[in-house]
Interface confidence: medium
């Protein structure tokens, strides 16, 4: 399909002249950020961004690539180097430490410098690094964590936890020897390390004692509480704050977010990770956009401002399954949340960053015609005289041999939400990729987001923009928090 | 390998504070660019940039990812949307039209709006679009084209040619019917469409009549002249300019570049594309860095300034072969040329842009240890109990089945320059990828390079920065050309 309009050079020249005009008008704000939002697309490499743009555009009956994601509208872009201290290709724990605490760590550790060693409890103490969220709280701001994964997952945990093993969700996951050495599970740290005003996502089962039935799945024992210490962490958290409210479904969330008596809100909507957006029961579970809106309603009451972490955490899971349909629909919901947040906040006082922790070995090739489905087939056949999809993975569970050969694929098969794109190497889970990821920035001090940077730079930009430790002498006016 | 200094949070905090300090000091220059340089890494997607950074770092005995490419030092970054009017995933012809002329075209056409149709000669006339190089020449600047491909290849041709078929290198490649309709081959257009001061690269055979032996390979008939019209285009070009010089080897190039009587220089160092850097005969053929230096020596004599196109054109070819070794070593030489150009020019008066025309379905995954070879194996085994490489392709010629199964691979095999990384789908040539590519910018008006842009924006930024058509009323001081 060749759009008639695009045949005319004037179309492109006019469009570029407008873009130039907008670029010339960009004025770096010299003010501090009252509010900080970091949107984290877990596994959202540049190939995911582009494919999601096309899909989102096509869902609006456009050809696709000419449209804009919400994040595309952010005026400043940088590239972020994601390696961890010990690996070229990182995990979500070490990267969370980088972009939330400003220090690089080791693979599968969280909130700890690289002096800590994976799974070695005794290397924890003294190596803790403090997140920007924690520093924002100390400065009198309200803070929140929103994710589509469990709230104890690696990325959100970077905002509040310190652990040598990202998999220590509840005490049942922590070896007895480590528990004896004083290493706490992530769920315990969620409620005890710092005061978090808003906590929204999945992860109910890690908060309740073993044997506690789940309210949504009371007959499914595997979904119930997992804790061995007999603690009801939700109860403990509620007891800390007079205005605290715990919710576990969408209806309760929407009510609580509008209730002025609620000062602290914890919403845990699934026992583990939240459901993929395409599987979500919209009567029971809120979308990421709805959780983001609820968080902003609460947090924005604070005249000193807020810090909010919003994660599209299951983009990564879709890719690990080699199911691009899931990864890309998750990315679109993530982008919808960014868009909604933009409507609810002002770029005059809110620094918003969008980034990824790492990429995936996910590619989009094959010379497909403009307007053709992102999940479709490439024109022509492969060397084995079979069709192939435009989306493919370097490695992952999509690798299958059928009668000693690569399976053929039809357009209807490849368009299925369950379809796993083929890969070069068979793995149970497709892996992360190590290339640089994009950082998109808007708001006060967003102009500092430039060039190629270490991933740690992100945390430092946020801290500087809001005049938080170690940048309290930031020399920005109006100083953060002057509105109270 | 965990570097001891990186275990200390102070290392990361100090580094980030320095980066913040540098970011705060960035001052958008309000002056015009006297000179324009566009460095085009053909097929150099973000995954290629990161992998090349690691390789270049390791060649300097560093761990890799913590090091800097020359392009990494450019202060401004944007993302460029590379689709062509008719394809989600473009080719180098349509993209060259975008970043050199500022207008998007159709797949495999060059220097024409999308009203032109591939291979249909009669759709050429009236649909020509004019490159920034051409506009620079009209403004009195000197102009040059440097590439590791043949100089008539798609990317450089975007600077001077208008053709409905990128493969029409010489008249022997143009169907008789199209010749009769008046469609000219690219080699002819190279010498007749505009006055180009410096032309360096490959592509000798397209300039000489059929039967003319090649000076380097006189006994290889397939490397000799291909022209059917009996023309010696080099002779015709030399006759146009009193100070014109033609060279075909490195020694002659170095001599000519230092000769003040040479005003125009054409150097064609191979019959077709230049050799891969790893195959280059350094006594006969110059490197991309050397060609770039020679071009800058000549062009910088013009007090009105210059426009220079420098292409690392065989990054793309390495990827098409699924030979990452070739692609990445080409990228390093490309980066070396960027570095050398930076030493020979000033960012006070020279706008330098680095970008790619498109990406490739090339990925870097598998959780390798820091410091391990980029060409090495991932830790552990795949589901088929065989080793696999960290570098892989979505599709391409690296797909092989051995006895109905994926072949095993050893570290020594994967480290070979000839090794083809495995792919999910078997193709004769690995394909381009459609995700956004990076644009790196330095110099006057580089700050305009921001956010997510159409690829066409690149040409417009260059034109605006140097006050060329259609931005002659650019209102920048000092105005371009005031130094003559």
């Amino acid at each position: 399909i060749i759009p008639v309009e695009e045949e005319n050079p004037d179309f492109w020249n006019r469009q570029a002249a407008e873009a130039l005009g907008a670029a010339k008008k960009l004025q770096p704000a010299q003010t501090a950020a009252k509010n900080l939002i970091i949107f984290l697309g877990d596994g959202m490499g540049v190939s995911t961004v582009t494919a999601a743009r096309i899909l989102k555009g096509q869902k609006k009956d456009k050809l696709g690539p000419e449209t804009f994601l919400a994040m595309d509208r952010f005026p400043y872009v940088a590239l972020s180097k994601t390696y961890s201290v010990d690996k070229h290709v990182p995990d979500s724990g070490a990267t969370a430490t980088a972009y939330l605490c400003g220090v690089k760590g080791n693979f599968q550790t969280i909130g700890l410098s690289a002096a800590a060693r994976f799974n070695q409890c005794n290397t924890t103490r003294g190596n803790e690094v403090i997140s920007v969220m924690n520093r924002a709280k100390k400065a009198g701001k309200s803070v929140g964590v929103v994710t589509t994964t469990r709230v104890q997952h690696a990325s959100p945990a970077g905002a509040y936890a310190h652990t040598v093993n990202r998999n220590w969700y509840s005490d049942a996951d922590v070896p007895a020897s480590a528990r004896q050495e004083g290493c706490q599970d992530i769920a315990t740290q969620l409620i005890s390390n710092m005061d978090i005003d808003v906590i929204l996502g999945g992860g109910r089962k890690y908060m309740f004692p073993m044997g506690t039935p789940d309210p949504e799945y009371p007959d499914d024992y595997s979904q119930g509480g997992t804790r061995l210490d007999g603690k009801n962490l939700v109860q403990e958290w509620l007891a800390k704050h007079q205005g605290a409210r715990y919710v576990w479904n969408r209806t309760e969330l929407l009510q609580a977010s509008l209730d002025p008596s609620v000062t602290h809100l914890m919403g845990l909507f699934e026992p583990g990770d939240m459901k993929y957006e395409i599987h979500r029961d919209s009567t029971l579970d809120p979308s990421l956009m709805e959780m983001t809106e609820a968080a902003l309603l609460l947090l924005s009451r604070n005249p000193r401002g807020f810090f909010l972490f919003v994660e599209g955490g299951r983009i990564d899971h879709g890719h690990h399954e080699s199911r691009a349909y899931r990864a890309l629909t998750e990315t679109i919901m993530f982008d919808d949340a960014i868009e909604r947040a933009g409507q609810l906040t002002s770029e005059e006082d809110t620094l918003s960053l969008v980034t990824a922790d790492h990429s995936h070995v996910f590619s989009f090739g094959g010379y497909p015609l403009r307007g053709s489905s992102i999940f479709g087939l490439a024109p022509g056949k492969a060397r084995d005289r079979k069709a192939y999809t435009v989306l493919l993975y370097g490695n992952g569970p999509g690798y299958v041999l059928k009668d000693g050969a690569r399976p053929d694929v039809t357009e209807s098969e490849s368009g299925s939400p369950e379809y796993r794109q083929q890969s070069a190497v068979p793995l149970d889970g497709e892996t992360h990729a190590g290339e640089d990821v994009a950082v998109f920035a808007r708001g006060p001090q967003a102009h500092l987001v430039h060039g190629v940077q270490e991933q740690t730079f992100i945390a430092h930009v946020m801290a500087f923009a809001a005049c938080l430790e170690p940048y309290t002498a930031c020399d920005l006016a109006p100083r953060a928090g002057t509105t109270d | 390998i965990i570097p001891v200094e990186e275990e200390n949070p102070d290392f990361w905090n100090r580094q980030a504070a320095e980066a913040l300090g540098a970011a705060k000091k960035l001052q958008p220059a309000q002056t015009a660019a006297k000179n324009l340089i566009i460095f085009l890494g053909d097929g150099m997607g973000v995954s290629t940039v990161t992998a090349a950074r690691i390789l270049k770092g390791q060649k300097k005995d560093k761990l890799g990812p913590e090091t800097f490419l020359a392009m990494d030092r450019f202060p401004y970054v944007a993302l460029s949307k590379t689709y062509s009017v008719d394809k989600h995933v473009p080719d180098s012809g349509a993209t060259a039209t975008a970043y050199l002329c500022g207008v998007k075209g159709n797949f495999q056409t060059i220097g024409l709006s999308a009203a032109a149709r591939f291979n249909q000669c009669n759709t050429t006339r009236g649909n020509e679009v004019i490159s920034v190089m051409n506009r620079a020449k009209k403004a009195g600047k000197s102009v040059g084209v440097v590439t590791t491909t043949r100089v008539q290849h798609a990317s450089p041709a975007g600077a001077y040619a208008h053709t409905v078929n990128r493969n029409w290198y010489s008249d022997a490649d143009v169907p008789a019917s199209a010749r009769q309709e008046g469609c000219q081959d690219i080699a002819t257009q190279l010498i007749s469409n505009m006055d180009i001061d410096v032309i360096l690269g490959g592509g000798r055979k397209y300039m000489f009549p059929m039967g003319t032996p090649d000076p380097e390979y006189p006994d290889d008939y397939s490397q000799g002249g291909t022209r059917l019209d009996g023309k010696n285009l080099v002779q015709e070009w030399l006759a146009k300019h009193q100070g014109a010089r033609y060279v075909w080897n490195r020694t002659e190039l170095l001599q000519a570049s230092l000769d003040p009587s040479v005003t125009h220089l054409m150097g064609l160092f191979e019959p077709g594309d230049m050799k891969y850097e790893i195959h280059r005969d350094s006594t006969l053929d110059p490197s991309l860095m050397e060609m770039t230096e020679a071009a800058l020596l000549l062009l910088s004599r013009n007090p009105r300034g210059f426009f220079l196109f420098v292409e690392g054109g065989r990054i793309d070819h390495g990827h098409h072969e699924s030979r990452a070794y070739r692609a990445l070593t080409e990228t390093i030489m490309f980066d070396d040329a960027i570095e050398r150009a930076g030493q020979l020019t000033s960012e006070e008066d020279t706008l330098s842009l680095v970008t790619a025309d498109h990406s490739h379905v090339f990925s870097f995954g598998g959780y390798p240890l820091r410091g391990s070879s980029i060409f090495g194996l991932a830790p552990g085994k795949a589901r088929d109990r065989k080793a696999y490489t960290v570098l892989l392709y979505g599709n391409g010629p690296g797909y092989v089945l051995k006895d109905g199964a994926r072949p095993d691979v050893t570290e020594s095999e994967s480290g070979s320059p000839e090794y083809r990384q495995q792919s999910a789908v078997p193709l004769d040539g690995e394909t381009h990828a459609g995700e956004d590519v990076a644009v790196f910018a330095r110099g006057p008006q580089a700050h305009l390079v921001h956010g997510v842009q159409e690829q066409t924006f690149i040409a417009h930024v260059m034109a605006f920065a140097a006050c060329l058509e259609p931005y002659t009323a650019c209102d920048l001081a000092p105005r371009a050309g005031t130094t003559d």
């Epitope: 008639v4 309009e5 009956d61 050809l63 368009g415 | -």
Partner: antibody, heavy 123, light 106 residues
Framework: EVQLVESGGGLVQPGRSLRLSCTAS????????MSWVRQAPGKGLEWLAL??????????EYTASVKGRFTISRDNSKSILYLQMNSLKTEDTAVYYC??????????????WGQGTLVTVSS | DTQMTQSPSSLSASVGDRVTITCKAS??????IAWYQQKPGKAPKLLIH???TLQPGVPSRFSGSGSGRDYTFTISSLQPEDIATYYC????????FGQGTKLEIK
């Protein structure tokens, strides 16, 4: 040149069904989105239904007022667009137009229209 | 669903007058708006799409502008043959027409 010719209109009683056709020529039918739009006497235009092209699997969309009663379909071998209208109401009285979208840069604007066919629903 | 509010519903003007019609969308429609002219007994005719792009053969006295939610259609110098009803159409999210503006000569 692009031509769209609607047929099948006429007088029909409330509660009954009617099928409209739109015969297309002058373009590759399968490449384009097709829509039905109606205009009640003396009133404005109302978009009713859309059927997408081959590349997007011929998926359909409807405006709320006709969803469940009207069905858009296409016979690609004959280049004919259909609108099956069931459980007709008096308020469905209108001139019915078929329209073809054009893929400009900006999406799916309704660029080509038929001359319309009048449907009168009355007892 | 995106709603389009078109105003005025009717207007009377003299030949040579500058005429302006506005459409307001219920949400940002990203410039995806078209303007149509319809004469009695005829099908609508596309004049402008993507806010401001004139269809081939449409006189240059017709123009469009706007962004976000607010859009304007202008006839710079009204001609007798311009007497018709004009509709806006958003096509950002499926399709929605404005209510129409009936243009008459004074």
């Amino acid at each position: 040149e692009v031509q769209l010719v609607e047929s099948g209109g006429g007088l029909v009683q409330p509660g009954r069904s009617l099928r409209l056709s739109c015969t297309a020529s002058g373009f590759t039918f399968t490449d384009y989105y097709m829509s039905w739009v109606r205009q009640a006497p003396g009133k404005g235009l109302e978009w009713l239904a859309l059927i997408r092209n081959k590349a997007t699997g011929y998926t359909t969309e409807y405006t709320a007022s006709v969803k469940g009663r009207f069905t858009i379909s296409r016979d690609n071998s004959k280049s004919i667009l259909y609108l099956q209208m069931n459980s007709l109401k008096t308020e469905d009285t209108a001139v019915y137009y078929c329209a073809r979208a054009s893929f400009y840069y900006d999406g799916k604007v309704l660029a080509y229209w038929g001359q319309g066919t009048l449907v009168t629903v009355s007892s | 669903d995106t709603q389009m509010t078109q105003s005025p519903s009717s207007l009377s003007a003299s030949v040579g007058d500058r005429v302006t019609i506005t459409c307001k969308a219920s949400q940002d429609i990203n410039k995806y708006i078209a303007w149509y002219q319809q004469k009695p007994g005829k099908a609508p005719k596309l004049l402008i799409h993507y806010t401001s792009t004139l269809q081939p053969g449409v006189p240059s006295r017709f123009s469009g502008s706007g962004s976000g939610r607010d859009y304007t259609f202008t006839i710079s110098s009204l001609q007798p043959e311009d007497i018709a009803t004009y509709y806006c159409l958003q096509y950002d999210n499926l399709y929605t027409f404005g209510q129409g503006t009936k243009l008459e000569i004074k």
